[in-house]
Amino acid sequence: QDTPALGKDTVAVSGKWYLKAMTADQEVPEKPDSVTPMILKAQKGGNLEAKITMLTNGQCQNITVVLHKTSEPGKYTAYEGQRVVFIQPSPVRDHYILYCEGELHGRQIRMAKLLGRDPEQSQEALEDFREFSRAKGLNQEILELAQSETCSPGGQ
């Protein structure tokens, strides 16, 4: 499945990921109560399509975004260049850190998210994510996210 048109990096991060934790450099307006797994789908040219559903304030919010590959490995742009996304491997197997900076609700924000192939929380991956967040100056508390295979409005 790994073709030159897709690229090794893109294929490696394709598939189903659980969003384990997130943090930011400032208060995030709407914190999700739970999240469905994130599906990353490799596209031609090395781009990635990301899909996730978040339950926020009793409402299911479907998010689909195309991450456009850049010349720098692991670096993508989204929302017509308004957001830069870095996808880097965690030292813990089957975990990645997704770091993004750009505009959210009209203000500049920096965020990090911990992704894992397994729904169970890895303490080592979480602790490394904590240290990564400190190094990046992301000083908000780390939010550990409740996992849900499907989104049910009005409840979990």
């Epitope: 880097q88 030292p91 190094a135």
Partner: nanobody, 112 residues
Framework: QVQLVESGGGLVQPGGSLRLSCAAS????????MGWYRQAPEKEREWVAS????????NYADSVKGRFTVSRDNAKNTVYLQMNSLKPEDTAVYYC?????WGKGTLVTVSS
């Protein structure tokens, strides 16, 4: 298993310098963010500095900004803390942290 071993501590005069080292093993060091922390006598352990896996990003506690520099050598699996313009209030046991694991610490005493 994960091992972190700090070294380089000692007695130094105010205004002096020290370089701490932390040798790491048991995990994929080049991908791991690493941190330095310290605990002064009768005080809580506090964060000092952190560095990302590639070493491209660093961050410091306000109390050490401009005086301390964190760096790493991924070929040697080692993280460093260069401490300049040391003050008596920097006296503490300095700990290295990675993947949630702690080293045993190295004592830094700043005194004339």
């Amino acid at each position: 298993q994960v091992q972190l071993v700090e070294s380089g501590g000692g007695l130094v005069q105010p205004g002096g310098s020290l370089r701490l080292s932390c040798a790491a093993s048991g995990f994929t060091f080049r991908l791991a963010a690493m941190g330095w922390y310290r605990q002064a006598p009768e005080k809580e352990r506090e964060w000092v500095a952190s560095i990302t896996g590639p070493g491209t990003d660093t961050n410091y506690a306000d109390s050490v900004k401009g005086r301390f520099t964190v760096s790493r050598d991924n070929a040697k699996n080692t993280v460093y803390l260069q401490m300049n313009s040391l003050k008596p209030e920097d006296t503490a046991v300095y700990y290295c942290r990675g993947m949630g694991y702690w080293g045993k610490g190295t004592l830094v005493t700043v005194s004339s």
